[in-house]
C-alpha cells in the first residue's frame, strides 16, 4: 500500500519516518538512494540491476513471458490541503527475484517528467522472495502551482510499470487571474470591469465594490463582468472574491472622466531665422485621452497690424513646430493649444518673439572696374543698394571676382566692409578676362550677385575695358 | 592640442614681396578662420585680413588691400599671407591666429584664441 | 574704424597686490545679438599673445580665476585680484563687434 501525510518538518530522515509497506521483515534494515533527480538504484552488486539479497535463477526468454504481472501496491489518491504546508506521498512496488532486469523509478506530473532537485528518496528492502522498493516525495511548502496528478514510472523487464494517480489538491484564497483594469472614459458612456478568480476549492463568487460600496447585493460566479452605464466623476472600482477558505480584494482601479487637455506650459523659442521661428512647448495634462493635435497660434505684435491670427497645426508629438513664412525683422505673439478626443484645451500664455533680419533682396548697383596698371590692381567701385528695414544692417559686401585664360580658371571672393564702396584687387592672370560680381550682406544673409561685369586683363600694357552699370550677363564693353 | 607653427624671420628689399606661412594641427582646418595681426616694434597691434578656408573667403583691412593675398593649402592645413611692394613701415613681427568658423568674416565674432608664434620681418636696403 | 584707447601704458604694482587695467571704445560694442564681443589678451616679454577673456568676463580655459573682466557699452576693465610674477607683460583689449576688429594700444603690468 502508499501513505501520504502531511508534516510540519523538513530534515530528511524525519521527512520518511512513517510507516512503512507490507511484506518487511522488520530485522532487514532498508537501503535508501536520496534522488536529486531521477531516481537510480544502487550499483549492481552481482551483475544484475537490483541489489542482490538471493541468487536469483536465469530466466530464459520464453520463461520470461510466464513470469507473474508486477504493479504498484494502490495508494492514497487524493491530497487535499492548505496553501504553504507540508506534504509527502509514496509509491511502492514488490519485485520477486525472478525477474533480473529492473530499473529507477521516475515521478512524473501531469505526464511530464519531474526532473531537477526535487525532494524524493528511494528505499530498497530486500528479502528471500525478492525486493520491496518505496519511493517517497515530499513537498515543502506548497503552491498552487503545486496542484495536479502526481504518479511513478518504472522498466521490469523491458515493460513500463505506472502508479495509479496521487491527486494533490492545494486548496487557498481565491486567486485572482484577471482584475479590472483602469480605464479612461467619456461622461455617462457604458463601459465593462472583468474580474476573474479560481480556487480551489471552487466555486468563487464575486462581490463589486465603487468607492468602497458593494454594488451587486448578490454574489456572482466568477469570472463576472460589471457594466457601468456611465460616470460623471472618477470612481475607484474593486472586486472581492470568496471561497470557503476566505475572502481576497482585488486591487482598486481608478476610472477616470475624460476631459479637455489643460494648456500647454513652458513655451520658449529655440531658434529664430529671418523668416521662421522654431517654437516648443510643455504639453498641459492630457485630460486622461490621448493629446492627438496642436495649433500654434500666431499675431503680429506691432500696434499698426490689423490683427489677423496665424493658424499652423501640427501632431502633438515632437512638442515642437517651426513657423514659417514670417517676416524679416518682425515681432509676433505666439501661443499653443492642444486638442484630445474630447476637445482643444484653453490656450498657453502668450510669448514675444522676434524673426531677424533678412537678408538683402537686391543686389548693388552700378558697379564698374578699372584696371590700375602701375599698380597692377583692379580698381571696383558700385553704389549702396536700397536696403529695407527688415532686410537688416549692411555690414559689408561680397565680391567675386573670376578669372579666366586659355588653360586656367580661378575663382576667388573676397568680403568689404559697409563702410566705402570701393574695393582694389590684385591682378590675379594677365592676358585674361576678369568677371566681377558683388552681393550686399547683412547679418540676415547674403543678397544676390549682380549681373557680371567682365574686364580684359592685357598682356602687358595695352587695356580693353568698359565701366559698366547695368552689364548684359556675360556682357564685355570696350573702350 | 591646437597648434600654429609659423615660418621663420625674413631679411627682404623694399619693394619686393613676401609669403609668411603658418601650418595648423590639432583641429579641423576648414572648421575655423584664420587671421593675420601685425604688430610693429614697441607698438600695438593691427588686423590684417582673414580667409575662411571652409567656403573660401577673404577679407581684408582696408589698409593693406590690394597688397596682401590670404590664401590657404587645406591639403597641408597651412594658411599663407603674402605682402607686395614692401616698404620699410612693413618691418614687424606677423603673427597668425585662429578665430571662430562664421558664414561672413565680417561678421562679430572672431575670437582670436590661438596665436602663432610670430614671424620677424625686416625691410631693408 | 572703432579706436580702442587703453589710458594707462604702463602700470607698476607689487606682487600680491591688486591690479586695474581699463579699455575705453570710440563707440558702444554691444551688438545687435546682444552679445558684447570685448576681448583681453596677454603678451608676456618675448611672447606671442594669448586670449584671456572673451566677451567681457568670460574666462579661457586654464586662465586663474584671480582673472576678471567687466564693462559693458564702451567702458571696460580687467582686475587681477593678486598679481603675481607670471601675470606680468603687455595686456591688450580689441573689439570683435565693429568691422575692422581694433586693438588698444597695450598696458604693460611690471614690477614696482
Known amino acids: 500500500g502508499g501513505t501520504a501525510e502531511k508534516w510540519e518538518e523538513t530534515e530528511l530522515d524525519q521527512l520518511f519516518s512513517g510507516p512503512l509497506p507490507g511484506r518487511l521483515p522488520v530485522n532487514h534494515r532498508p537501503f535508501s538512494a536520496p534522488h536529486s533527480s531521477r531516481d537510480q538504484l544502487p550499483p549492481p552488486q552481482t551483475g544484475r540491476s537490483h541489489p542482490a539479497h538471493t541468487a536469483a535463477p536465469q530466466v530464459t526468454s520464453t520463461a520470461s513471458k510466464l513470469l507473474p504481472p508486477v504493479a504498484f501496491n494502490h495508494t492514497i489518491g487524493h491530497i487535499v490541503l492548505s496553501e504553504h504546508k507540508n506534504v509527502k506521498f509514496n509509491c511502492s512496488i514488490n519485485i520477486p527475484n525472478t525477474y533480473q532486469e529492473t530499473a529507477g523509478i521516475s515521478w512524473w506530473k501531469d505526464g511530464k517528467e519531474l526532473l531537477g532537485a526535487h525532494h524524493s528518496i528511494t528505499q530498497f528492502y530486500p528479502d528471500e522472495e525478492g525486493v520491496s522498493i518505496i519511493a517517497l516525495f515530499s513537498i515543502a511548502s506548497v503552491q498552487r502551482s503545486d496542484n495536479g496528478s502526481y504518479f511513478c514510472k518504472m522498466k521490469v523487464n523491458n515493460r513500463e510499470i505506472v502508479s495509479d494517480p496521487i491527486y494533490v489538491e492545494v486548496q487557498g484564497l481565491p486567486y485572482f487571474i484577471k482584475q479590472p483594469e483602469s480605464v479612461n472614459v467619456t461622461r455617462n458612456t457604458a463601459f465593462n470591469l472583468t474580474c476573474q478568480a479560481v480556487g480551489p476549492p471552487e466555486p468563487v463568487n464575486i462581490f463589486w465594490v465603487q468607492n468602497s460600496s458593494r454594488v451587486n447585493e448578490k454574489p456572482e460566479r466568477s469570472p463576472s463582468v460589471l457594466t457601468v452605464p456611465g460616470l460623471t466623476e472618477t470612481a475607484v472600482f474593486s472586486c472581492e472574491a470568496h471561497n470557503d477558505k476566505g475572502l481576497t480584494v482585488s486591487k482598486g482601479v481608478h476610472i477616470n472622466i475624460k476631459v479637455i487637455p489643460s494648456p500647454p506650459t513652458e513655451v520658449h523659442i529655440l531658434n529664430s531665422t529671418a523668416h521662421s521661428i522654431l517654437v516648443s512647448w510643455v504639453p498641459g495634462f492630457d485630460g486622461y485621452s490621448p493629446l492627438q493635435n496642436c495649433s500654434i497660434q500666431v499675431k503680429e505684435a506691432d500696434r499698426l497690424s490689423n490683427g489677423s491670427v496665424m493658424v499652423f497645426n501640427t501632431s502633438a508629438s515632437p512638442h515642437l513646430y517651426e513657423i514659417q513664412q514670417l517676416q524679416a525683422l518682425a515681432n509676433y505673439s505666439i501661443a499653443v493649444s492642444c486638442r484630445n478626443e474630447i476637445g482643444w484645451s484653453a490656450v498657453s500664455p502668450w510669448i514675444l518673439a522676434s524673426t531677424t533680419e533678412g537678408a538683402p533682396s537686391v543686389a548693388p548697383l552700378n558697379i564698374t572696374v578699372f584696371l590700375n596698371e602701375s599698380n597692377n590692381i583692379l580698381d571696383i567701385r558700385w553704389t549702396k543698394p536700397p536696403i529695407k528695414r527688415q532686410d537688416g544692417e549692411l555690414v559689408g559686401y561680397r565680391i567675386s571676382h573670376v578669372w579666366e585664360s586659355a588653360g586656367t580658371y580661378k575663382e576667388l571672393s573676397e568680403e568689404v566692409s559697409q563702410n566705402g564702396s570701393w574695393a582694389q584687387i590684385p591682378v590675379q592672370i594677365h592676358n585674361a578676362t576678369c568677371t566681377v560680381r558683388i552681393a550686399a550682406i547683412t547679418k540676415g544673409g547674403i543678397g544676390p550677385f549682380s549681373e557680371p561685369v567682365n574686364i580684359i586683363i592685357p598682356e602687358h600694357s595695352k587695356v580693353d575695358y568698359a565701366p559698366s552699370s547695368t552689364p548684359a550677363p556675360g556682357n564685355t564693353d570696350s573702350m | 592640442e591646437v597648434q600654429l607653427q609659423q615660418s621663420g624671420p625674413e631679411l627682404v628689399k623694399p619693394g619686393a614681396s613676401v609669403k609668411i606661412s603658418c601650418k595648423t594641427s590639432g583641429y579641423t582646418f576648414t572648421e575655423y578662420t584664420m587671421h593675420w595681426v601685425k604688430q610693429s616694434h614697441g607698438k600695438s597691434l593691427e588686423w590684417l585680413g582673414g580667409f575662411n578656408p571652409n567656403n573660401v573667403i577673404t577679407s581684408y583691412n582696408q589698409r593693406f588691400q590690394g597688397r596682401a593675398t590670404l590664401t590657404v593649402d587645406k591639403s597641408s592645413s597651412t594658411a599663407y599671407m603674402e605682402l607686395r611692394s614692401l616698404t620699410s613701415d612693413d618691418s614687424a613681427v606677423y603673427y597668425c591666429?585662429?578665430?571662430?568658423?562664421?558664414?561672413?568674416?565680417?561678421?562679430?565674432?572672431?575670437?582670436?584664441?590661438?596665436w602663432g608664434q610670430g614671424t620677424t620681418l625686416t625691410v631693408s636696403s | 574704424d572703432v579706436v580702442m584707447t587703453q589710458s594707462s601704458l604702463t602700470l607698476s604694482v607689487t606682487i600680491g597686490q591688486p591690479a586695474s587695467i581699463s579699455c575705453k571704445s570710440s563707440?558702444?560694442?554691444?551688438?545687435?545679438?546682444?552679445?558684447?564681443?570685448l576681448n583681453w589678451l596677454l603678451q608676456r616679454p618675448g611672447q606671442s599673445p594669448k586670449r584671456l577673456i572673451y566677451l567681457v568676463s568670460k574666462l579661457d580655459s586654464g586662465v586663474p580665476d584671480r582673472f576678471t573682466g567687466s564693462g559693458s557699452g564702451t567702458d571696460f576693465t580687467l582686475k587681477i585680484s593678486r598679481v603675481e610674477a607670471e601675470d606680468l607683460g603687455v595686456y591688450y583689449c580689441w573689439q570683435g563687434t565693429h568691422f575692422p576688429w581694433t586693438f588698444g594700444g597695450g598696458t604693460k603690468l611690471e614690477i614696482k
Open positions: 591666429t585662429r578665430g571662430d568658423l562664421l558664414w561672413s568674416l565680417l561678421l562679430p565674432g572672431n575670437y582670436f584664441d590661438y
Open positions: 563707440q558702444s560694442l554691444l551688438d545687435s545679438d546682444g552679445k558684447t564681443y
